[in-house]
C-alpha cells in the first residue's frame, strides 16, 4: 500500500525517502519512478543515483538532501495535476530480493484562489470592460481588455494600480509580510 | 569507538553569548548531519537544528533561528552551538547528537547551560 | 510543524508485565519514526529507528511497530532497569520534532 503525500500546484512536492549506509560511503543505488514499484528496478525512472553520484535525473527533479548520508528525499519542483501519482523510491540494496521499497501517492491539489486585493476590484468595478485574470506560477499573467472611453491619466493611474496589486501578490505567494 | 564528547559546564549573564562545542572521535562529521537538542530540568527534548559539515548546509527550528547558530570544523571534527542574547529560558542542558540520517544514533553527554545574573 | 502527541505521559507498571507507549503524528510521517528511551540523570538512547528497526545492543523485549500517523513501544517482560523516560521522534520533516515523553516507574 502507498503512503499519501499532498502539494499544490505551483509549489514544490516534497517525497521523503531515506536508508542507513552500511558506513560512510559505503552507498547503494537508489531509483526513484512513476508508477508503482515492479518488481524489479523502477519504471519510468524519474532520478537515479550510483555507489558515487546523482547519475541521471529529468528536469524539475532533485534530490534535496545528502544523497551521501542516505537522504534520498525526492523533490518535484513546480508542480501540476499531472504530476498526481504514484512514486517508487527503491533502495537497492545488494543480494537477492534486499531491495526496499516506498510507494509514495502524490495528490496535487489546485492552488488556492486568493481573492483580488480591494483596490483592484473597485479598478475593476469602475472599469468594466477590463478583464483582470490572476494565475499561478511563472506563466502568471494579468490581462487587459479594450478600454476605448478611459483617458491617459486613468490608465497611468491604473497601471500604477495593477502593478501594486501584482507586486502584493507576488509578495504574498512567497510566504512574505506585507507591512 | 563513536564518542561525542561536549565541553564543560556555563554560567553566563543574561544578554551574553555562549559557545558550545561538541568533539567527534571514532568517525568523521563530515560523513554525517549534527544536531544540537534542548533539554530543560525535568522537560522533554527540542531541536535546535543540524549543519551538514560536508557543506555546511544549517537547518533550524523557526524557535532557535536568531537565538543558535551552528558551527562545523572538519579540521578539529569539531560541532558547535552558538547562543546568543542569553535569558533564564535559555537554561537547560544542550546536546549534540549525530543522525544516519533522520535518527539520532549518538549522542554527547550534555553541557549544563545556566543563565543567572 | 509536525506535532508528536504521545501517551499516556506517566505509567507504573509491575516488573514482569508488558507495557505499551502510543506517539500520534500531526500527519503523514510513513515509518520515518525513532524511539529513545532516557534513565534518571542520562543522555538519550536510540532503541528503536524506522518505527520497529530494534538498534543494535537494544534487548529484544523492546519492540515498535506503526505507520503512517499511529505508532507504538511495547515492552514485555518489564526489568527494573527498564525505569526511564521514552520518547518518540519524527525524522521525515524539518524541523524534526519529539513526543512529550512517557515516564515509566515500576510499581
Known amino acids: 500500500s502507498e503512503v499519501e503525500y499532498r502539494a499544490e500546484v505551483g509549489q514544490n512536492a516534497y517525497l521523503p525517502c531515506f536508508y542507513t549506509p552500511a558506513a560512510p560511503g559505503n552507498l547503494v543505488p537508489v531509483c526513484w519512478g512513476k508508477g508503482a514499484c515492479p518488481v524489479f528496478e523502477c519504471g519510468n525512472v524519474v532520478l537515479r543515483t550510483d555507489e558515487r553520484d546523482v547519475n541521471y535525473w529529468t528536469s524539475r527533479y532533485w534530490l534535496n538532501g545528502d544523497f551521501r548520508k542516505g537522504d534520498v528525499s525526492l523533490t518535484i519542483e513546480n508542480v501540476t495535476l499531472a504530476d498526481s501519482g504514484i512514486y517508487c523510491c527503491r533502495i537497492q540494496i545488494p543480494g537477492i530480493m534486499n531491495d526496499e521499497k516506498f510507494n509514495l501517492k502524490l495528490v496535487i491539489k489546485p492552488a488556492k484562489v486568493t481573492p483580488a486585493p480591494t483596490r483592484q476590484r473597485d479598478f475593476t468595478a469602475a472599469f468594466p470592460r477590463m478583464l483582470t485574470t490572476r494565475g499561478h506560477g511563472p506563466a502568471e499573467t494579468q490581462t487587459l481588455g479594450s478600454l476605448p472611453d478611459i483617458n491617459l491619466t486613468q490608465i497611468s493611474t491604473l497601471a500604477n494600480e495593477l502593478r501594486d496589486s501584482r507586486l502584493a501578490n507576488d509578495l504574498r505567494d512567497s510566504g512574505a509580510t506585507i507591512r | 569507538e563513536v564518542q561525542l564528547q561536549q565541553s564543560g559546564a556555563e554560567l553566563v549573564r543574561p544578554g551574553a553569548s555562549v559557545k558550545l562545542s561538541c568533539t567527534a572521535s571514532?568517525?568523521?562529521?563530515?560523513?554525517?548531519?549534527m544536531h544540537w537538542v534542548k533539554q530543560r530540568t525535568e522537560q522533554g527534548l527540542e531541536w535546535i537544528g543540524r549543519i551538514d559539515p560536508d557543506n555546511d548546509e544549517i537547518k533550524y527550528a523557526p524557535k532557535f533561528q536568531g537565538k543558535a547558530t551552528l558551527t562545523a570544523d572538519t579540521s578539529s571534527n569539531t560541532a558547535s552551538l552558538q547562543l546568543s542574547g542569553l535569558t533564564s529560558e535559555d537554561t537547560a542542558v544542550y546536546y549534540c547528537?549525530?543522525?544516519?540520517?533522520?535518527?539520532?544514533?549518538?549522542w554527547g553527554q550534555g553541557t549544563t547551560l545556566t543563565v543567572s545574573s | 510543524d509536525i506535532q508528536m502527541n504521545q501517551s499516556p505521559s506517566s505509567l507504573s507498571a509491575s516488573l514482569g508485565d508488558t507495557i505499551t507507549i502510543t506517539c500520534h503524528a500531526s500527519q503523514n510521517i510513513n515509518v520515518w519514526l525513532s524511539w529513545y528511551q532516557q534513565k534518571p540523570g542520562n543522555i538519550p538512547k536510540l532503541l528503536i529507528y524506522?518505527?520497529?528497526n530494534l538498534h543494535t545492543g537494544v534487548p529484544s523485549r523492546f519492540s515498535g511497530s506503526g505507520s503512517v500517523t499511529g505508532f507504538t513501544l511495547t515492552i514485555s517482560s518489564l526489568q527494573p532497569e527498564d525505569i526511564a523516560t521514552y520518547y518518540c521522534q519524527q525524522g521525515q520533516n524539518i524541523p524534526y520534532t519529539f513526543g512529550g515523553g512517557t515516564q515509566l516507574e515500576i510499581k
Open positions: 524506522k518505527a520497529s
Open positions: 571514532g568517525f568523521n562529521i563530515k560523513d554525517y548531519y
Open positions: 547528537a549525530r543522525s544516519s540520517p533522520y535518527y539520532f544514533d549518538y
